[in-house]
């Protein structure tokens, strides 16, 4: 059989058939089914859901569906000894205590096993001391406090508002500043959009709502006790003192009703400027400590959570490829939730479920993809991307040789305004071409393409007439595939209007109020945005698995490499004297980027012209495309972050959610003016330029003619 015959038994089995089979009503039903009870990682409920998904994926027609289990470190509150924060008077009496749970939403009052708000992996402790308000607890916020305002956080309990950066970075920054405890809270400025009611009457956060979340700084390690290797039945586990990424000080999250009680008493310094003020009716004084009559009162934390090695379960489904079964296209999203998971993750899991059902329908009619498609329902994402990372560690040898692409499928929506895509530059053209073929679900864009509404609402800052596509950061299950293994990756979801809604994420993120009704009543009553996201994610998987030539354009990598080189050069040029003194040159990097550009251009020309009926040449060209992302991997990893090995992209050292380009050079340059040994610091900059230049040149050579 020709490759065409193998992948299209009858002409109707094409992308259109796959997309037409996707139904909004099914996604709605699946979402309802997945959100009726909590599915916290490590619990019986989540194990049962794993088995249900396994069973349904088999029914849908996948060739095999297996559970892959691991025993990883998780964290839970103590059921009999709750976590809370108090204000204590000079006699040590508790005169105010924060709430022990969120008031349950209507209809869920009798649901058991709702985990109370907590910061996963917080150590136990009962620190007491003066409070310091540290804004978002970003690196620049601590610079402001320590360097500008001369406020010492050592021995203090800090209170930080959620938003802007990953909470784990906030905790790390607080630890480095010497704090002895961290209180995290959701400020209405970030989690209450003006003109919208709070849940259950709207999609805003009520005062008793609290964001859960882990506070690890894993830097891609996966299970804290088994970094680099799977947490299987014969694993060697580190002692807790040697575990990766655990915080060393107690941390606890609260809502804005409780935060008001703490912040209203704050004394010390006024906030340095308007960017430190939220929307509560408090002065946002920084401290340290309380004002006036309250100056003898302190804050005390009571944290009793425990870390426990617990079994987790991934569901791995396989749809074998007809022509290249040893080439894997992976669609994965997590299943575990903090509570009901109405958006995170089940709006994504419901979409994956419907994509599997559509592929299964085609398979039952005799169709197979050209390449193998793997579907994954990951566990313990909320505890540090553990399920995906352990599975990738277990299967790393296969993945690095056979992995074509990974498409992530967490929350399908974080708003209902427009599309949001983060991906490798290799996928830009795939995303553009696909969205041009899909209908926009947006009001006012009837009959127009998704590409058109997306470009209009979220234009590229660099290229007119094109939509914004962002860099991949982390904070989700693509991390191990992209940042560690160098497998081309992408993600897509519907998002909010970032210009008019300044709140961080969506207001009810990781709260008990993230329910099915939140989605069905307020975000997507017709499930049309979910359907569009299913079409984008599913369409990308279909094309990656089925196109004869992989839909990767290496020329787009050349364009961004030049942009990133220009950007990092301009950062370095803020120090012209030092660059001269220490002979810092970016010539090697710009030369490598120029070579990459030329070689990529020639490769693309050959890609147009080669004989696609020659399976050996076809496979050779596809392998060059598949392995290009892999070529950006440095086996030694980034400094102090061995599992972040991609030289072009890494999660920002200051915000895990954000991607940074040329991260090795960027981190070497960061705050370089404060380094005690400038010669050593600029030497590291030079070394990182060398590593980047070498890597870009080496990647370019993988695209050269093989002989």
């Amino acid at each position: 059989k020709s490759s065409n015959e193998a992948t299209n038994i009858t002409p109707k089995h094409n992308m259109k058939a796959f997309l037409d089979e996707l139904k909004a009503e099914n996604i709605k039903k699946f979402l309802y089914n997945f959100t009726q009870i909590p599915h916290l990682a490590g619990t019986e409920q989540n194990f049962q859901l794993a088995k249900q998904i396994q069973s349904q994926w088999k029914e849908f027609g996948l060739d095999s569906v297996e559970l892959a289990h691991y025993d990883v470190l998780l964290s839970y509150p103590n059921k009999t000894h709750p976590n809370y924060i108090s204000i204590i008077n000079e006699d040590g009496n508790e005169i105010f205590n924060t709430s022990l749970f969120e008031p349950p939403p209507p209809g869920y009052e009798n649901v058991s096993d709702i985990v109370p708000p907590f910061s996963a992996f917080s150590p136990q402790g009962m620190p007491e001391g003066d409070l310091v308000y540290v804004n978002y607890a970003r690196t620049e916020d601590f610079f402001k406090l320590e360097r500008d305002m001369k406020i010492n956080c050592s021995g203090k309990i800090v209170i930080a508002r959620y938003g802007k950066v990953f909470r784990g970075n906030k905790v790390k920054n607080a630890q480095l500043a010497g704090a002895k405890g961290v209180i995290l809270y959701s400020d209405p400025a970030d989690y209450f959009a003006p003109g919208v009611k709070s849940y259950p009457d709207g999609w805003n956060l009520p005062g008793g709502g609290v964001q859960r979340g882990n506070i690890l700084n894993l830097n891609g390690a996966g299970d804290p006790l088994t970094p680099g290797y799977p947490a299987n039945e014969y694993a060697y586990r580190r002692g807790i003192a040697e575990a990766v990424g655990l915080p060393s000080i107690p941390v606890h999250p609260i809502g804005y009703y409780d935060a008001q009680k703490l912040l209203e008493k704050m004394g010390g310094s006024a906030p340095p400027d308007s960017s430190w003020r939220g929307s509560l009716k408090v002065p946002y004084n920084v401290g340290p400590g309380f004002t006036g009559n309250f100056s003898t009162q302190k804050v005390k934390m009571h944290i009793h959570s425990t870390n426990e090695v617990t079994r987790i379960y991934n569901v791995i489904g396989t749809l074998r490829g007809a022509v290249e079964p040893d080439r894997y296209v992976i669609l994965g999203g997590h299943r575990d939730s903090w509570v009901f998971g109405g958006i995170d993750p089940q709006s994504g899991a419901a979409v994956v479920h419907e994509i599997v059902r559509s592929f299964g329908t085609l398979k039952k009619e005799g169709w197979r993809p050209r390449r193998t498609i793997l579907f994954a329902s990951w566990d313990a994402e909320e505890f540090g991307l553990l399920g995906s990372t352990e599975w990738a560690e277990e299967n790393s040898r296969l993945l690095q040789e056979r992995g074509v692409a990974y498409i992530n499928a967490d929350s399908s929506i974080e708003g209902n305004y427009t599309l949001r895509v983060d991906c490798t530059p290799l996928m830009y053209s795939l995303v553009h071409n696909l969205t041009k073929e899909l209908k926009s679900p947006d009001e006012g864009f009837e009959g127009k393409s998704l590409y058109e509404s997306w470009t209009k609402k979220s234009p590229s800052p660099e290229f007119s007439g094109m939509p914004r596509i962002s860099k991949l950061g982390s904070g989700n299950d693509f991390e191990v595939f992209f940042q560690r293994l160098g497998i081309a990756s992408g993600r897509a979801r519907y998002t909010k209007n970032w210009e008019t809604n300044k709140f961080s994420g969506y207001p009810l993120y990781h709260s008990v109020y993230e329910t099915y009704e939140l989605v069905e009543k307020f975000y997507d009553p017709m499930f049309k945005y979910h359907l569009t996201v299913a079409q984008v994610r599913g369409g990308m998987v279909f094309e990656l698995a089925n196109s004869i030539v992989l839909p990767f354009d290496c020329r787009d990598y050349a364009v961004v490499l030049r942009k990133y080189a220009d950007k990092i050069y301009s950062i370095s040029m803020k120090h012209p004297q030092e660059m001269k003194t220490y002979s810092v040159s970016f010539d090697s990097l710009f030369s490598a980027v120029k070579n990459f550009t030329e070689i990529a251009s020639k490769f693309s020309e050959r890609l147009q012209d080669f004989d696609k009926s020659n399976p050996i040449v076809l496979r050779m060209m596809n392998d060059q495309l598949m392995f290009l992302e892999r070529a950006f991997i440095d086996p030694l990893g980034l400094p102090d972050r061995p599992f972040y090995r991609h030289v072009i992209y890494a999660p920002s050292s200051h915000n895990k959610y954000a991607g940074e380009s040329f991260p090795g050079i960027y981190d070497a340059l960061f705050d370089i003016e404060s380094k005690v040994d400038p010669s050593k610091a600029w030497g590291e900059v030079k070394r990182q330029i060398y590593v980047a230049a070498f890597t870009v040149q080496a990647a370019a050579e993988t695209l050269s003619e093989v002989a």
Epitope: G268, S275, N285
Partner: antibody, heavy 115, light 107 residues
Framework: EVQLVQSGAEVKKPGASVKVSCKAS????????IHWVRQAPGKGLEWIGN????????TYNQKFEDRVTITVDKSTSTAYMELSSLRSEDTAVYYC????????WGQGTTVTVSS | DIQMTQSPSTLSASVGDRVTITCKAS??????VDWYQQKPGQAPKLLIY???TRHTGVPDRFSGSGSGTDFTLTISRLQPEDFAVYYC?????????FGQGTKVDIK
């Protein structure tokens, strides 16, 4: 060496606007608050407002709120204070000061408002 | 607005004297108080921040103390270069406010 160098003296008519600049050097401009303070002849110090050069966040003295705008240009490490609808009582020396605790001061800019 | 009231307004002293200037806040300001020195025709200079911490390069004859509403700047042994106007300032509430100044002149 930390330096804050302000623009030269200005003479303005009532109702006009004045924009005073303050160029910083010798430190990381984005890390430190810039305050603006004025001192009328023979009088004490009066705080006008401040800015965080990193993100442009400002706070103004309500007394001046409807007339003052403080901005920065990060590329040139320069802060600006613009005061509009000038009146004779705005005649003063205007200082910029760097650091939350007013660690370093510019040399001052004399603004004279006279018809 | 928080009022900062300095006393005395003028203080005549001799070289070598111990000089104390007080500053009273109209409400509790914790320790969020700075002290500045200004000489004629010059910009003010920071002496003390957070009520009691000397700024870099400030001689140790200058010291600050106090919390809540009552603050003191002390010059232990007055030097010729110390004749100037001294201002206290609070930074616990906006608008940031200064005392009216204390002029230290030669007796």
């Amino acid at each position: 060496e930390v330096q804050l160098v302000q623009s030269g003296a200005e003479v303005k008519k009532p109702g006009a606007s004045v924009k005073v600049s303050c160029k910083a050097s010798g430190y990381t401009f984005t890390e430190y608050t810039i305050h603006w303070v004025r001192q009328a002849p023979g009088k004490g110090l009066e705080w006008i407002g401040n800015i965080n050069p990193n993100n442009g966040g400002t706070t103004y003295n309500q007394k001046f709120e409807d007339r003052v705008t403080i901005t920065v240009d990060k590329s040139t490490s320069t802060a600006y204070m613009e005061l509009s609808s000038l009146r004779s009582e705005d005649t003063a020396v205007y200082y910029c000061a760097g650091g939350w605790t007013f660690d370093y001061w510019g040399q001052g800019t004399t603004v004279t408002v006279s018809s | 607005d928080i009022q900062m009231t300095q006393s005395p307004s003028t203080l005549s002293a001799s070289v070598g004297d111990r000089v104390t200037i007080t500053c009273k806040a109209s409400q509790d300001v914790g320790t969020a108080v700075d002290w500045y020195q200004q000489k004629p025709g010059q910009a003010p200079k920071l002496l003390i921040y957070w009520a009691s911490t000397r700024h870099t390069g400030v001689p140790d004859r200058f010291s600050g103390s106090g919390s809540g509403t009552d603050f003191t700047l002390t010059i232990s042994r007055l030097q010729p270069e110390d004749f100037a106007v001294y201002y206290c300032q609070q930074f616990t509430r906006y608008p940031l406010t200064f005392g009216q100044g204390t002029k230290v002149d030669i007796k």
